[in-house]
Each structure stands twice: as C-alpha cells, then as structure tokens.
Interface confidence: medium
C-alpha cells in the first residue's frame, strides 16, 4: 500500500513536470494548449518513529526516510486534517525490553478538535501478561480503521511506556490516507 502511494506521488510529480514542458513548447509553436488534466493530490501521510520523543503525544519523523506527507499537515506530534471525509487511519508501535516485568502497555490513537471539549480515543490497544518475567521480550501493537474525519481534526498517538518503544522507521509509524 505504502509502495503504491509513493509510486503514485512520483508519477504525479513526473506528469506535472512533463505537463509544464509540453505546454511551454506548444505556446512557442502556436498550438492551442488543451486544458491540463487536473489530477488531485492524494491526501496521505506516513510518519515514522522519532527517538527524541520525550513526552506524550508521540512525535514523528516527517521529513527523512520513508516518510510521506501530502495534502495533510503535521504539527506538534499531530496529523491535521484539512478536508472532511472518510480516512483510513493506522498506527503501529513496537515495544521491547531487556527484562520483562509485564508493565501494562497501551497504545492509543486519539483526536482533538476545537469543536469538541476533550480528547476522543479513536482506537486503543492494551497488553498485559505478554512476556515471561525477567526475559528479554518484544511486542507490536497495530491499530487501523476507517473514520469520518472533519476539517481541523488533529490526530495523535499516545503510549503508556515511552521508554519501552523502539523507534525504528519500519517498526513504529503513524499514518492515514483519504479514501
């Protein structure tokens, strides 16, 4: 899915640059230029773990690596919706530790909007008794579902134990795309 979206964005950039070249050539030759085909930018975001996250909500890498950000804004840990509609929202968090003490783990995706007076939890994952005491361990939590989001909704991710999160870009991420 991610690969396809990246490919689509690349194709879009390519076709846009070709369109500019073609239309300038036509102007020189004197042919009437047909109206450019308007291909709307896909609203999509895929942000990856950022190891300097120090508090909640989690902060995300929005510039380097396998990151996508198109038609959606990133602001202080949150993805900001600018167009009402149906979105698939997802997040994966990779927890691990050297010595298991079965601390309860939670992973939430929640929403804020100035039109609503408190945070609204959209998705939540909880883990308890997930490892053998004293042993090295690792566990992933994946959340994903479709939501009707409104312009100005801010989406965030929260975890209960920040120190147990592995921020590798392939392991911990947060994203969405408009259907």
């Amino acid at each position: 899915q991610l690969f396809h979206l990246q490919k689509e964005l690349a194709e879009l950039r390519e076709s846009t640059s070709q369109m500019h070249t073609a239309s300038s050539l036509e102007k020189q030759i004197g042919h009437p230029s047909p109206p450019p085909e308007k291909k709307e930018l896909r609203k999509v975001a895929h942000l990856t773990g950022k190891s300097n996250s120090r508090s909640m909500p989690l902060e995300w890498e929005d510039t380097y690596g396998i990151v996508l950000l198109s038609g959606v804004k990133y602001k202080k840990g949150g993805l900001v919706i600018n167009e009402t509609g149906l979105y698939f929202v997802y997040s994966k968090v990779y927890f691990r530790g050297q010595s298991c003490n079965n601390l309860p783990l939670s992973h939430k995706v929640y929403m804020r909007n100035s039109k609503y007076p408190q945070d609204l939890v959209m998705m939540e994952g909880k883990m308890m008794s997930y490892c053998t005491t004293g042993q090295m361990w690792a566990r992933s939590s994946y959340l994903g579902a479709v939501f009707n989001l409104t312009s100005a909704d801010h989406l965030y991710v929260n975890v209960s134990e920040l120190s147990l999160v592995n921020f590798e870009e392939s392991q911990t991420f947060f994203g969405l795309y408009k259907l």
């Epitope: 909007n113 039109k115 609503y116 007076p117 408190q118 945070d119 609204l120 939890v121």
Partner: antibody
Framework: QIQLVQSGPDLKKPGETVKISCKAS????????MNWVKKAPGKGLKWMGW????????SYAEEFKGRFAFSLETSAGTAYLHINNLKNEDTATYFC???????????WGQGTSVTVSS | QAVVTQESALTTSPGETVTLTCRSS?????????ANWVQEKPDHLFTGLIG???NRAPGVPARFSGSLIGDKAALTITGAQTEDEAMYFC?????????FGGGTKLTVL
C-alpha cells in the same frame, strides 16, 4: 443503545448534602464529557458545568462555583453531582447530559428530583 | 450574562414546515456559539436534536434541521408531525459556558 440512568428522587433538609449519580452505558465513557443541567420548578434550564471524563477535570458555571462538585467513577462509567450545604433554592430536577463529538448535548438522563425542605 | 431569547409559543399543522429561532442579546449568533436544540416531552424527557448549529444527533429524523438565519440560530421542522408537539430549547455557547433559551412551546394541531 446509549443510556444515562440517574439515581432516584431525594428529599433533604437545608444544610444537608446530596449526591446524584448518573450511570452511562452503550458508549466509551471516557470519550465524551458529561454536563450537568438544573431545572427549577417554573424556571428554565441552567447549565451548571461539565466534567472531562478523560482527565476528571471539572469546569463550573460561575453561579455553581462553591457548593457544587462533579466527580467520576470511571471504572463504573458513572458521573456524580454533589451539592453541599443545601438551600431551598436548590430544589430542582438535575440532569446529566452527554457531550457528543461536537459541542452537542445529545443524550440526557431522566433527571433526578431534589427537594430541600425543613 | 448573555440572554438567549426564543418564541414563547408557535402553532403549526401536520405536514407544514415550521421554523423556531434563537436570538442572542450579545449580537448575531455565529457558528462559534455552537447552537444546540433540545426537545422536551412530558415527564422531563429531553432529547438532543441538533448540535454545532447544524449537526443532527444520532437517530433524529431528517425533518429536523439546524441553521443560521440572519443573526439568529434556527430549527426547522419540515413536514411537522403530531409527535413533534413539545417544548424546544436552544442553547448557545459563550466561550466557556452554555446559556439556554426560555423554550418554545410547539403545538401541532
């Protein structure tokens, strides 16, 4: 389906305390704030304030600061209204009202009648 | 403290369209007042109809709609039914508190 079930009517003397409960079901309790509204006999509706069911932080309308308190028992999905040092003018029906995703008061409890009389 | 004013009573007939309004003493009602409309039936049975000016609450029939008309908030019932006979209250948000109107008694004859 979503329901807000309030405790039964109460008859109190001036100076006493009353605790009204509001048991929520059919939705995630901690996602939606809870408002409290007063309706005195022959009078209109008055918004008393609300409590953030996520953080437990209450917010009171100016008129209801002091003797009134909101609290939660999150594990039971229950909100409470406490009124201390009851006065005759506290005689009213009190409603808990759920916020929806927007600033909207969508579901109302059936109301709890409190009569303060010596 | 702001005062919110509604028509004290309105009468309509089944199938007719009726509009109830809600005025603010502080000036024009805007979307920032997040106008709410609530229906009260006998025995203190309250139901939220509209929130945030025009968002219908779950399960509320499509004949109820909210809007801003001029400087007021409005509740329109398109094709009123006998069961719509009730008291209707509007509530407006003023930065940090709600103020309710006095209510409109709607009769459907």
């Amino acid at each position: 389906q979503i329901q807000l079930v309030q405790s039964g009517p109460d008859l109190k003397k001036p100076g006493e305390t009353v605790k009204i409960s509001c048991k929520a079901s059919g939705y995630t309790f901690t996602n939606y704030g809870m408002n409290w509204v007063k309706k005195a006999p022959g009078k209109g509706l008055k918004w008393m304030g609300w409590i953030n069911t996520n953080t437990g932080e209450p917010s009171y309308a100016e008129e209801f600061k002091g003797r009134f308190a909101f609290s939660l028992e999150t594990s039971a999905g229950t909100a409470y209204l406490h009124i201390n040092n009851l006065k005759n003018e506290d005689t009213a029906t009190y409603f808990c009202v759920k916020y929806s995703r927007y600033y909207a008061m969508d579901f109302w409890g059936q109301g709890t009648s409190v009569t303060v009389s010596s | 403290q702001a005062v919110v004013t509604q028509e004290s009573a309105l009468t309509t007939s089944p199938g007719e369209t009726v509009t109830l309004t809600c005025r603010s003493s502080t000036g024009a009602v805007t979307t920032s007042n997040y106008a709410n409309w609530v229906q009260e039936k006998p025995d203190h049975l309250f139901t939220g109809l509209i929130g945030d000016t025009n968002n219908r609450a779950p399960g509320v029939p499509a004949r109820f709609s909210g809007s801003l008309i001029g400087d007021k908030a409005a509740l329109t019932i398109t094709g009123a039914q006998t069961e719509d006979e009730a008291m209707y209250f509007c509530a407006l948000w003023y930065s940090n508190h709600w103020v309710f109107g006095g209510g409109t008694k709607l009769t459907v004859l």
